[in-house]
């Protein structure tokens, strides 16, 4: 009704199901990851399933080894196609150490900021991909608690390749990467036999990430 008490046409905005997520992928790029092509293939398969855009899902990528690099921010690209092109161009930065706690903490403190494109009220999801025990694992408890405090959902992926190639026990490594994953662990933790097998978990990982939207 208008101020003059005339009937006017009005409409309410269409109520959509939320399809908004801010996803930051935290990639181990240390020297032991091999072949890197398997990582970019995994990224391609995962990202092409996403409806990426400023009002839909946003994706940022952080790579770490000894140090941390923001490959691109959440708001850098506004379509799935653009993100796919950018992800293909990510080069392995290397590093003799695997600073997983630092990678996660940098993603939390920096990648999920509004300055880098994070949106208020939108669910935050972190996907951590690594192939070895971290050198800074004594800092993980704090880092994970900080993520919990900020309601960041974490999916963690353990690549067992370097352990299997060296015939080493994976027990400690798997425990560490499980500790990174959100609860329930069985829904948030994945392990693959080697880098090539990353693509085999894409479908399930994607489904579990997007189940968070509901």
């Amino acid at each position: 009704v208008s101020p003059t008490f005339q009937v006017v046409n009005s409409f309410a905005p269409v109520q959509e199901c939320s399809t908004q997520l801010d996803i930051v992928i935290v990639l181990d790029g240390s020297n032991s990851i091999y072949p890197w092509d398997s990582v970019t293939a995994f990224l391609n398969d995962l990202l092409e399933r996403m409806d990426i855009g400023p009002k839909q899902t946003q994706v940022g990528i952080v790579q770490y080894g000894e140090n941390v690099t923001h490959e691109f921010n959440l708001n850098k690209y506004s379509s799935t196609e653009e993100v796919l092109v950018a992800a293909k161009k990510i080069v392995q930065r290397g590093g003799r150490q695997t600073m997983t706690a630092l990678g996660i903490d940098t993603a939390r403190k920096e990648a999920f900021t509004e300055a880098r494109g994070a949106r208020r009220g939108v669910k935050k999801v972190m996907v951590i991909v690594t192939d070895g025990e971290s050198h800074d694992n004594h800092r993980l408890k704090k880092v994970i608690q900080d993520c919990e405090d900020e309601n960041i959902q974490r999916f963690s992926i353990a690549i067992l390749g370097s352990y299997n190639r060296g015939n080493l026990s994976t027990e400690k490594f798997v425990e560490e990467i499980k500790s990174i994953a959100s609860e329930p662990t069985e829904k948030h933790f994945f392990n693959v036999s080697d880098e090539l097998a990353l693509v085999t978990i894409v479908k399930t990982l994607g489904e579990r990430i997007f189940a968070l939207e509901a």
Partner: antibody
Framework: QVQLQESGPGLVKPSQTLSLTCTVS??????????WSWIRQHPGKGLEWIGY???????YYNPSLKSRVTISVDTSKNQFSLKLSSVTAADTAVYYC?????????WGQGTTVTVSS | EIVLTQSPGTLSLSPGERATLSCRAS???????LVWYQQKPGQAPRLLLY???SRATGIPDRFSGSGSGTDFTLTISRLEPEDFAVYYC?????????FGGGTKVEIK
């Protein structure tokens, strides 16, 4: 603001166990964003990290002392403690407790422990 | 363990002068895990810088830090009387956490 206060005997006999407690005031030890550390400083020397504990009870120790050190936490009392067994004169030092987030930003004033018979 | 070597051991300067303190690591340290402390006689250390170059709360801007990899520097642009103390670097990226041996900044 958060303050830390060490307490415990200032004199310990050789071969005995050194026991110190750090009481946290002005904030909860259960807030999960910090590690709670013990550091020591031998007379006229530099600083040595002994170890730290997370509120959940997870501990991390300096390997050089690991066989003799136990750090524990009592969240109900807002305290954490250090036990160092089989002490010798080489363990005579000022012992500090500290809060560790991105570096140790809050310290106790330190307590001098002398190991002597 | 990562060994941090600080130099010089003692720095003799006058108030108003610039102090440059070095911290060298035996292996690469992420700058995010490098901190600096100041300690005065009879007192506990005080956090000055974290992330190698970020000032802790209440630290004046005459204190600055730089460096990466194995070489880090603490600079005090103009020494004030209260700045004469011992300075320690520390890394916490690798366990055990380790401190440098310290640099004493004394009045010339």
């Amino acid at each position: 603001q958060v303050q830390l206060q060490e307490s415990g005997p200032g004199l310990v006999k050789p071969s005995q166990t050194l026991s110190l407690t750090c009481t946290v005031s002005g904030g909860s030890i259960s807030r999960g964003n910090y590690y709670w550390s013990w550091i020591r400083q031998h007379p006229g020397k530099g600083l040595e990290w002994i170890g730290y504990i997370f509120y959940s009870g997870s501990t991390y120790y300096n390997p050089s002392l690991k066989s003799r050190v136990t750090i524990s936490v009592d969240t109900s009392k807002n305290q954490f403690s250090l036990k160092l067994s089989s002490v010798t004169a080489a363990d005579t030092a000022v012992y500090y407790c500290a809060r560790d987030g991105y570096g140790m930003d809050v310290w106790g004033q330190g307590t001098t422990v002398t190991v002597s018979s | 363990e990562i060994v941090l070597t600080q130099s010089p051991g003692t720095l003799s300067l006058s108030p108003g002068e610039r102090a440059t303190l070095s911290c060298r690591a035996s292996q690469s340290v992420s700058s995010s895990y490098l901190v600096w402390y100041q300690q005065k006689p009879g007192q506990a250390p005080r956090l000055l810088l974290y992330d190698a170059s970020s000032r802790a709360t209440g630290i004046p801007d005459r204190f600055s830090g730089s460096g990466s990899g194995t070489d880090f520097t603490l600079t005090i642009s103009r020494l004030e009387p209260e700045d004469f103390a011992v300075y320690y670097c520390q890394q916490y990226g690798n366990s055990p956490l380790t401190f440098g041996g310290g640099t004493k900044v004394e009045i010339k």
